[in-house]
Every structure is written in C-alpha cells, then in structure tokens.
Interface confidence: low
C-alpha cells in the first residue's frame, strides 16, 4: 500500500465514487469521480496492486473524472484517489480517499439464505430469513418456490437483508437473489432453496425449484 511520508493532517481526504455504478457488467463505460473538499491542481487515481498511479488529471476545480472505457473483469479491484495543490511542496499529496471496490462481472456470487432462529418453527410463529451476499448496497428479493413474483423486496445498505415471514403462511420452500439497485443491472445467482416447516409437521412435499 502507499504510505505517504509527508505530514498530511491539513490535507483532507477526497471522496471517490463510480458512475453508473461500482458493480457493472463487462463492456460498460465507467467514470470514477474524485471529489476534493477544496480546489485542487492535480488528481491521481490508484489501483491496489500497482505501485504507480493508474491515471493523472490536471484540473483546477474540486473534482476530476477518470474514464474507464468498456471495462473488463481485470479492471475490477480496489481504487482510491489523492489530490494536490500547486502551492504545496514537491510530492505532498492529500490523504487517500475512501477505497472504491469496482466489480466487473456478468453475474454476482450466489447469496446464502438462512432462517433465524432456524428452519423449523412453532405453528403460527414468525420467522426471519436472512439473504446474505458479499456486497453492500444491493437490492434483495425473496421468492417462494411456485410463486412467480417476489414475496418481498428490500434495498439494503448492508451486504444482507432480513425478510420477516408472518405466522400461518410460513411453511414452504424459499430462495433469494440480489441485484444492483440501478442500471446497468447485474444479477446474482439464486440462493440454494431453503425449506421452512412447522414443528411436528413431518416431511413436506414442496417443489424445490432450481
């Protein structure tokens, strides 16, 4: 990692964002925007694993845009940016920005689906189903096998979402998936199916789905 040797207390960190999203399908044009809290002369974009800046931009404003054209999975990874002002001494740059994880993929990893406190519940009791991926800020959907439309949707800031199933309609086979909250949409694989049953109800003949 890059450890600046100059004292940086007075040079606040910039913010790095991605448009249209930080999770995209291959072939999309992605713009990484580095926004400084003050007007800057030069911006540098760094990618983890490279010991030299990936790109430089000379601008006299608060933000710089770095264009990644028709991204490939190899361009995914951890990015951060820094800025500097003309009147600073040689080599004195700002603190690093937040780390932006860029993911370029056709399909997101399969989430897990677990029941809390467990998949066997007392008749009429509520149960919580947690659909967990590895990427925060996704939209999660819960399906009941045999029902075409999602039972519930949740936009979550966490890499998981908790779905609450109420009472008597609980038993059944469930699965979930997640996707990016805005276009270009990238979908995950569906989770493995999870069977929820009432205590003492014996084996249930629910369609497993795929």
């Amino acid at each position: 990692d890059f450890t600046p040797t100059a004292p940086l207390a007075s040079y606040p960190q910039p913010w790095l964002g991605a448009h249209p999203a930080a999770v995209v399908t291959p072939g999309i044009n992605v713009t990484l925007t580095c926004r400084a809290p003050q007007s800057a002369w030069r911006f540098a974009l760094f990618k983890s694993g490279l010991v030299t800046p990936l790109l430089l931009r000379d601008v006299s404003v608060e933000l710089a845009e770095f264009f990644l054209e028709e991204v490939t999975p190899a361009q995914g990874g951890s990015y951060h940016c820094r800025y500097r002002k003309t009147d600073w001494g040689p080599g004195v740059w700002s603190q690093p920005s937040n780390v932006l994880e860029l993911l370029v993929t056709d399909q997101l990893p399969r989430p897990s689906l677990v029941a809390l406190p467990g998949p066997v519940v007392a008749p009429g009791a509520n149960v919580s189903l947690r659909c967990a991926g590895r990427i925060p800020g996704m939209s999660f959907a819960l399906y009941r096998v045999g029902v075409a439309t999602p039972l519930q949707y949740i936009d979550s800031v966490q890499p998981w979402a908790d779905f609450l199933l109420i009472g008597t309609h609980t038993p059944g086979t469930y699965c979930c998936y997640y996707h990016t909250p805005s276009a270009p949409y990238v979908l995950s694989q569906r989770s493995q199916p999870l069977v929820i049953s009432f205590e003492g109800s014996g084996s249930l003949d629910y369609t497993q789905g795929n």
Epitope: F2, R42, L50, V51, T52, L54, A74, P90, G91
Partner: antibody, heavy 118, light 108 residues
C-alpha cells in the same frame, strides 16, 4: 523538453561502491514512479528497482540489500547506491519514468556504463 | 532465465508481416498489462506499445500489440530495414517488473 540524464558510472573494483544519479527535466518529478533498469553487455533488459510516488521503494530480488534507490524531489533527481559490487553487475544502467496505465516505462535516459573489474 | 519467454530471433523481408510472441503466466501477463520496447543497436530502449495494444504518439501504426490469456504478441507489418532491432516485452508481477529475454529481428 522531457529529458533524463544519468551519471556516476565508471570502473570500480569488485566489492566497491558506486552511486548513480539521474537528473530529470521537463515535467513534475514528484508525480511519477521512477525506476532503474540495467543491461549487461550482449544481454537483455533487467529491472533493478523502483521508487514510487508514495511508500517504500521496491527491488528485484537479486538487488535487495546491496542496492538502494532514493529520490530528491526538490532536485528532480533519482539515485542508485550500489554496494558490494560484483563482476556480474557490469552493465549499462538506465533510469526510466513510468507511465500511468499499468506500469510501462515511457521515457528512458541514455544510460551510464558501470564496469566492475580488478 | 527470463520469466517472460520470447523467441531469441525472428526475421522477415521488407514489406512482410512479422509477429513476435511473449509467453508468461496468470500472475504476470494474465492479470496485468503488457508493454513492448524497441532497442536499436547502441541506443536506449524506446516504448512501442503500452497497455497491451496502445501506441504512444510517434509510433507508426505498422506496430500493433495484442494479448490473449497469458500470452502477448507484437506484430510488425510492412517490414522496413530500419525495424532491425531487439524487441522486448514487459509486464508486472507482485511489485516487480519483468522483461522478456528479447527477440533480435533481422530484416533480410
């Protein structure tokens, strides 16, 4: 005009030391990754060491401990301190500037010849 | 011995198309960019191709680069006598730069 000028090469005995310099002009020295690459007579290019914009220098395995890279941003100069020199260190030493699309070297100096011989 | 493997020599006649290969592994070429350099006798190397297939300004479009998996190649079309030189591929692997052993191109 962008220019790199190496100096400090010459004849040195085995076990001796030498300090190479690379003076840069024409751009903001402190913004770039700088590196040394060498070429033994009749042989190919071999990366020696690099000095990043931020953080610790990095070295090819063969040179860790014997060679030290450093930079003086105020003088726009890159250095290579070479200790415990051996006959096989005889080579032309080039300094080069790295570009920003994944680690290529876009500007090279003319090179300085180091000869290690008794 | 170089981690990136190039043929030691290649040749062609004026006007011909010549290709020089560079073979590596997933830890270098497979996951990183490849660059190509031309070194004329007695001179410093000159950047020909960077980022797998990009040409710096001033490099003729007769020179082109490509990468597939863990291998890369440099193609020179419309070969000229002044193309006679050594050609080196270069990539990156866990904080160090790697060069191929070089290919001596002879224009017959």
């Amino acid at each position: 005009e962008v220019q790199l000028l190496e100096s400090g090469g010459g004849l040195v005995q085995p076990g001796g030391s030498l300090r190479l310099s690379c003076a840069a002009s024409g751009f903001t020295f402190s913004d770039y990754y700088w590196t040394w690459v060498r070429q033994a007579p009749g042989k190919g290019l071999e990366w020696v060491s690099g000095s990043p914009v931020f953080g610790a220098a990095n070295y090819a395995q063969n040179f860790q401990g014997r060679f030290t890279i450093s930079r003086d941003n105020s003088k726009n100069t890159l250095y290579l301190q070479m200790n415990s020199l051996r006959a096989e260190d005889t080579a032309v030493y080039y300094c080069a500037k790295a570009g920003f699309t994944g680690g290529h070297f876009d500007i090279w100096g003319q090179g300085t010849l180091v000869t290690v011989s008794s | 011995q170089s981690v990136l493997t190039q043929p030691p020599s290649a040749s062609g006649t004026p006007g011909q198309r010549v290709t020089i290969s560079c073979s590596g592994s997933s830890s270098n070429i497979g996951n990183n960019y490849v660059s190509w350099y031309q070194q004329l006798p007695g001179t410093a190397p000159k950047l020909l191709i960077y980022g797998n297939s990009n040409r710096p300004s001033g490099v003729p479009n007769r020179f082109s680069g490509s990468k597939s998996g863990t291998s890369a190649s440099l193609a020179i079309s419309g070969l000229r006598s002044e193309d006679e030189a050594d050609y080196y591929c270069q990539s990156y692997d866990s904080s160090s730069w790697l060069f191929g052993g070089g290919t001596k191109l002879t224009v017959l």
